[in-house]
């Protein structure tokens, strides 16, 4: 029997569905257990317009120790502001700098990524180290990318099409699924129905998918039916915040006994025959109906409280309105320049604008310091002598007051220039992981420890070795040692900074030839970027130190030149 | 508007002294660092001193260190300039100027000090 | 201490184009700003930055800087440009200001 129930999209304000999923495009998941490097490539594809992106790395311990480096090669086809959270991972990151923006600086070893074409950036990820995944996603709000979680089959990733990629992706697409809604005709009553398709995916076994309902009803007011239909390798975890009849395939369980499963029932994989299933269960209004993909978590917010739906009036808009002005990340697109007299802050309109921000005065921490509107920019600017800036030994610092049309209190950020004539750079050669006596001299086929070091230490900035390399003469030629701060060879080790951190890496150095240089200088790149702020604030310096070589040793690792 | 206005210049004889003041208004003076710079007759600009917004700082330059002692007082928007043991080349133009949105953005019309017996 | 050098004077026709070089070691490092001053009268910020106008400054003033040399250029240069001008920076090292020895523009 045909049920009579013309499903019309729902507005957002009647019902929202958000997904996390690791079905991707294109994707692959391979294994590469003996690689010193785990790879990890996304293409990201963004509509036009600064997109706002959240990346969390997630790293599983395998007997107690971390897993190895990593390379996360991001392309991306269009502007990304990107939250990246990477705790404690020892990663490196490829990406196109003219289009991804850090909302803090992102305290890892980055890399500039070619503007290759797909395949190319494979084929430049894999001349790194086999690559353990890559994916494809098409506008994504957040991904979780966890490290060491491999289970592909494979032992080569090469992209496929609809691939699902296991526990190793999770990813949240920005624009919310598409809820339908309609009236059951011919049955009585304020029943509603919110029916959950999740369409079959390409699976490796059991799944759970969590599902969070919030219904915005007081609770009395509420008669509803919750059906969630799925391939039979998928169970329930349902997190609702009212009573409601479950009617689900597979088995559920509820967030508050999740230990406690129960058995469901065969339900149609139809459309139709889901709705046919909610008039059965007496529902007069199918408040909600939504198809997914395979997904972990799906959250479904709805404010009907049955018989009262609304559908959107044709055409339809399926992607929701832009979220409402974001301060935090405003705050972060002050840029901050540094001059040898002045200290500038600058906001660009475009920018601004993007993010649906109305911006009513932006000052530094006194509020007589206003910033001037240049037509394409609010540009704020003072003398360090001047605005409440507050003056230490190796930086001058202030605070950036933005008001904002949408928030009753002003935005506030700290903003800091470097001193650099107060800062002193040094670098230590130690014979011992400890870094405790320091040394001029290296032994071939010795390990040796170096540290950087900058003084008075600066907390607000982050000290980072770009690059360091051996320079032994015209005999001896130059060995590289880091490069876009990652270890060159085998015979060198980016290591943990120290407490203070200082950057710390160790190298062995040995010679295929004669005769073998007495003398080297070691020269090393530094940057001091800020841990909260613009990426424009980078300093570099370049230091040196000289260094005496002794007992020559003809085995090898590192070659000469 | 912002004005400054100069005043205490005059005739003195060499090693003795004199009190430069500099009268602001028409904006936030308590916010700004203030400079005195001073002007030979028929010469170039020749910076004197500096002074933070809320006097933490205060920077000479190597001619005039140790004899001129630059201060403010925010109460009363007042820039300040004690000159001890002056000298014949001490004779010139005194501005000062605010230290604010862009580099010496606003410049008193001067007071003229000559050093001479 | 750190050294500006300007050239003492400089010659342009009306509608012609004027150049003022300031030299310093490493300037281009350095934020340069330009004062104009016409006789009798308190100098004015005329580039601010090596190359921002303030405003009310007309776009024909500009600024440069890099290497050892920073420049000031006036375009379609008019009489009432007949003036000195001084470069300025600030020298970090010492926590002084430093200014040039200044250059007399002179409109033939």
């Known amino acids: 029997e045909t049920v009579h129930c013309d499903l019309q999209p729902v507005g957002p304000e009647r019902g929202e569905v958000t997904y996390t999923t690791s079905q991707v495009s294109k994707g692959c998941v391979a294994q590469a257990p003996n690689a010193i490097l785990e790879v990890h490539v996304l293409f990201l594809e963004f509509p036009t317009g600064p997109s706002q992106l959240e990346l969390t790395l997630q790293a599983s311990k395998q007997n107690g120790t971390w897993p190895r480096e990593v390379l996360l090669v991001l392309s991306v086809n269009s502007s990304v502001f990107l939250h990246l959270q990477a705790l404690g991972i020892p990663l490196h990151l490829a990406y196109n700098s003219s289009l991804v923006t850090f909302q803090e600086p992102p305290g890892v070893n980055t890399t500039e990524l070619p503007s290759f074409p797909k395949t190319q950036i494979l084929e430049w990820a894999a001349e790194r180290g086999p690559i353990t995944s890559a994916a494809e996603l098409n506008d994504p709000q957040s991904i979780l990318l966890r490290l060491g979680q491999a289970q592909g089959s494979l032992s080569f990733c090469m992209l496929e099409a609809s691939q699902d990629m296991g526990r190793t992706l999770e990813w949240r697409p920005r624009t919310p699924a598409l809820v339908r809604g309609c009236h059951l005709e011919g049955v009585a009553g304020h029943k509603e129905a919110h029916i959950l398709r999740v369409l079959p995916g390409h699976s490796a076994g059991p799944r759970t998918v969590t599902v969070k309902v919030e219904l915005s009803c007081a609770p009395g007011d509420l008669d509803a039916v919750l059906i969630l239909q799925g391939p039979p390798y998928v169970s329930w975890l349902i997190d609702a915040n009212h009573n409601m009849q479950i009617w689900t395939t597979g088995e559920y369980s509820f967030k508050i006994f999740p230990e406690k499963n129960i058995r469901g029932f065969k339900l149609p994989d139809t459309p139709q025959g889901l709705l046919g299933e909610a008039r059965m269960l007496n529902a007069s209004i199918v408040a909600s109906f939504v198809e997914l993909p395979l997904a972990s978590i799906v959250s479904l917010h709805a404010s009907s409280c049955g018989g009262r739906l609304q559908t959107s009036p044709a055409p339809i808009q399926t992607t929701p309105p832009k979220d409402t002005c974001s301060p935090e990340l405003l705050m972060s697109l002050i840029q901050t320049k540094c001059a040898d007299d002045a200290m500038t802050l600058v906001l660009k309109k475009e920018l601004v604008a993007h993010l649906k921000c109305t911006i009513t005065g932006l000052t530094f921490w006194d509020p007589s310091c206003e910033a001037e509107d240049r037509g394409d920019k609010f540009v704020l600017r003072s003398a360090y002598s001047s605005c409440g800036m507050q003056v230490s030994a190796s930086m001058i610092s202030n605070e950036a007051v933005v008001n904002i049309l949408s928030s009753s209190s002003p935005q506030r950020k700290k903003v800091h220039c470097l001193n650099m004539d107060s800062l002193s750079f040094q670098l230590g050669l130690y014979l011992s992981p400890h870094f405790l006596q320091a040394s001029n001299t290296i032994e071939p086929g010795q390990q040796s420890f170096v540290q950087v070091r900058v003084s008075p230490s600066v907390s607000e900035f982050l000290l980072q070795l770009d690059s360091c390399h051996l320079d032994l003469g015209p005999e001896g030629g130059t060995v590289e040692l880091i490069q876009g701060r990652a270890a060159k060879g085998n015979c060198v080790s980016l290591l943990s900074p120290s407490p203070e951190g200082d950057p710390r890496f160790s190298f062995l150095l040995h010679f295929y030839t004669v005769p073998i240089p007495k003398t080297g200088t070691l020269s090393c790149t530094v940057a001091l970027r800020p841990k909260t702020g613009s990426q424009d604030q980078e300093v570099h310096r370049t230091v040196f130190m000289r260094l005496n070589i002794i007992s020559p040793d003809l085995s090898g690792c590192t070659s000469k030149g | 508007q912002v004005q400054l206005v100069e005043s205490g210049g005059g005739v003195v004889q060499p090693g003795r002294s004199l009190r430069l003041s500099c009268a602001a208004s028409g904006f936030s003076f308590s916010s700004y660092g203030m400079h005195w710079v001073r002007q030979a007759p028929g010469k170039g600009l020749d910076w004197v001193a500096i002074i933070w917004y809320d006097g933490s700082y205060k920077y000479y330059a190597d001619s005039v260190k140790g004899r001129f002692t630059i201060s403010r007082d925010n109460s009363k928007n007042t820039l300040s300039l004690q000159m001890n043991s002056l000298r014949a080349e001490d004779t010139a133009v005194y501005y000062c100027?605010?230290?604010?949105?862009?580099?010496?953005?606003?410049w008193g019309q001067g007071t003229l000090v000559t050093v001479s017996s | 201490s750190y050294v500006l050098t300007q050239p003492p004077s400089v010659s342009v026709a009306p509608g012609q184009t004027a150049r003022i070089t300031c030299g310093g070691n490493?300037?281009?490092?350095?934020?340069v700003h330009w004062y104009q001053q016409k006789p009798g009268q308190a100098p004015v910020l005329v580039v601010y930055d090596d190359s921002d106008r303030p405003s009310g400054i007309p776009e024909r003033f500009s600024g440069s800087n890099s290497g050892n040399t920073a420049t000031l250029t006036i375009s379609r240069v008019e009489a009432g440009d007949e003036a000195d001008y001084y470069c300025q920076v600030w020298d970090r090292s010492s926590d002084h200001v430093v200014f040039g020895g200044g250059t007399k523009l002179t409109v033939l």
């Open positions: 490493n300037i281009g490092s350095k934020s």
């Open positions: 100027a605010r230290d604010g949105k862009y580099p010496f953005d606003y």
